[in-house]
């Protein structure tokens, strides 16, 4: 969480951002809130990115002002116009690119004063894993598959029964480049699987951590997956 304060002239206002991560090819949100104003026409929102000459986005007098918007963000940005009046300056970024990563500044002007806060935005790819039972040549294995990851993650297996066991010797992980030549499909196979046990496949890079759990019994197989973004720090 980054909380910024305005400096000069008029009173300063509090602006708060949250470091976040974008999933490439999907839409992302750059979060920013501020002390609201009673008149929409008095609010100016500017989003800037370190190292980029033009603006990322500008909203003033109740509407978008994109004449100074940088080419790399053309047609890809929007604020939540109906929420600006309540202090939401968050930016929606369409079709997140790897190159969108960096330091952004959310700069606010209202009748009460000015303020800004920086935001670290990471980009990559992350997806939920699915764990299934595979059966080949009379032996049961578990196959953990996740369609899109970048940068290349680590994959670790764990088991409820054999807590603390190292499964690296009895598992095999492969990374297959997807058609867009950036993200990769993750496939990890665990051998020597026993029934009446819960196994977890944990996939992690510096952006996200995902877990696929599978509980295997004779009568049923229970599966669940979780995805957690890392380093979501507020400023």
């Amino acid at each position: 969480l980054i909380i910024g304060f305005g400096i000069s002239g008029r009173h300063s206002i509090t602006v708060t951002t949250v470091a976040s991560a974008g999933n490439i090819g999907e839409d992302g949100i750059l979060s920013c809130t501020f002390e609201p104003d009673i008149k929409l026409s008095d609010i100016v929102i500017q989003w800037l990115k370190e190292g980029v000459l033009g603006l990322v986005h500008e909203f003033k007098e109740g509407k978008d002002e994109l004449s100074e918007q940088d080419e790399m963000f053309r047609g890809r940005t929007a604020v939540f116009a109906d929420q600006v009046i309540v202090g939401n300056a968050s930016l929606r970024l369409k079709n997140v690119q790897l190159t969108d990563a960096g330091t952004y500044k959310c700069y606010i002007i209202t009748s009460k004063g000015k303020g800004n806060a920086n935001l670290e935005y990471k980009t990559g790819a992350f997806s939920m894993p699915e764990v299934n039972v595979d059966y080949n040549a009379s032996s049961e294995t578990l196959r953990c598959e996740a369609p899109r990851w970048f940068p290349q993650p680590t994959v670790v297996w764990a088991s409820q029964v054999d807590q603390g066991a190292n499964f690296s010797e009895v598992s095999n992980t492969s990374f297959e480049l997807n058609s867009e030549n950036v993200t990769m499909k993750v496939v990890s196979v665990l051998y020597n699987v026993t029934i009446n046990n819960t196994y977890s496949c944990m996939i992690e890079n510096d952006i996200a951590k995902a877990t696929g759990d599978i509980k295997v019994t004779e009568s049923e197989i229970k599966r669940r997956s979780h995805l957690q973004l890392l380093n979501s720090k507020a400023s």
């Epitope: 299934n132 059966y135 049923e220």
Partner: antibody, heavy 114, light 107 residues
């Protein structure tokens, strides 16, 4: 005795939604997942999804994802299946089944017709 | 999705006959296979789970066998109450899929 009692038959217009209930008794509701399966007239059985009543974690059949919503009310030990944007092909008998699909409800007939 | 193919789709048999229904999976599912019985207007009943384990209360004339991709449900001596439709179902991989069903009719 394990029992799953489902709500009565429904007739719906195309484009509308239907919500089917399944009241469980005779066992600890939160200890078993609940599955939903449908059967179109003269057809076989088709699995739609499953929900863990303890925390409402859901696995959907991708075929229905976006159209089906599974929920539970722990206070009444009732599971619900809501299907939206109904079309004529959704005319079927809808069943709830306790995981591991060992006990089934009696079925709810949903007819989609203009 | 895993395809489950049941055969025959229907059969005629007499009381006392030995009846065999087969189910084939499009890929290996180990032993994660259930067999169900369905009668018109009645709740579906689980007969066998994990290929060969008899569900509680199911008569011993029902048995299951197989592994991998090929499975069999056998009724050793058909009784009047056994005339119904039988389904296999795999639960190895999501989405769970059923066979097309086998209707057992009176000859």
């Amino acid at each position: 005795e394990v029992q799953l009692v489902q709500s009565g038959a429904e007739v719906k217009k195309p484009g509308s939604s239907v919500k089917v209930s399944c009241k469980a008794s005779g066992y600890t509701f939160t200890s078993y997942w609940m599955h939903w399966v449908r059967q179109a007239p003269g057809q076989g059985l088709e699995w739609m999804g499953e929900i863990d009543p303890s925390d409402s974690y859901i696995n959907y059949n991708q075929k229905f994802k976006g159209r089906v919503t599974l929920t539970v009310d722990k206070s009444t030990s009732t599971a619900y299946m809501e299907l939206s944007s109904l079309r004529s092909e959704d005319t079927a008998v809808y069943y709830c089944a306790r995981g591991p699909r060992d006990y089934w409800g009696q079925g709810t007939t949903v007819t989609v017709s203009s | 999705d895993i395809q489950m193919t049941q055969s025959p789709s229907s059969l005629s048999a007499s009381v006392g006959d030995r009846v065999t229904i087969t189910c084939s999976a499009s890929q290996g599912i180990s032993n994660y296979l259930n067999w169900y019985q369905q009668k018109p207007g009645k709740a579906v009943k689980l007969l066998i789970y994990y290929t060969s384990r008899l569900h509680s209360g199911v008569p011993s004339r029902f048995s299951g066998s197989g592994s991998g991709t090929d499975f069999t449900l056998t009724i050793s001596s058909l009784q009047p109450e056994d005339f119904a439709t039988y389904y296999c179902q795999q639960y190895s991989k999501l989405p769970y899929t059923f066979g097309g069903g086998t209707k057992v009719e009176i000859k």
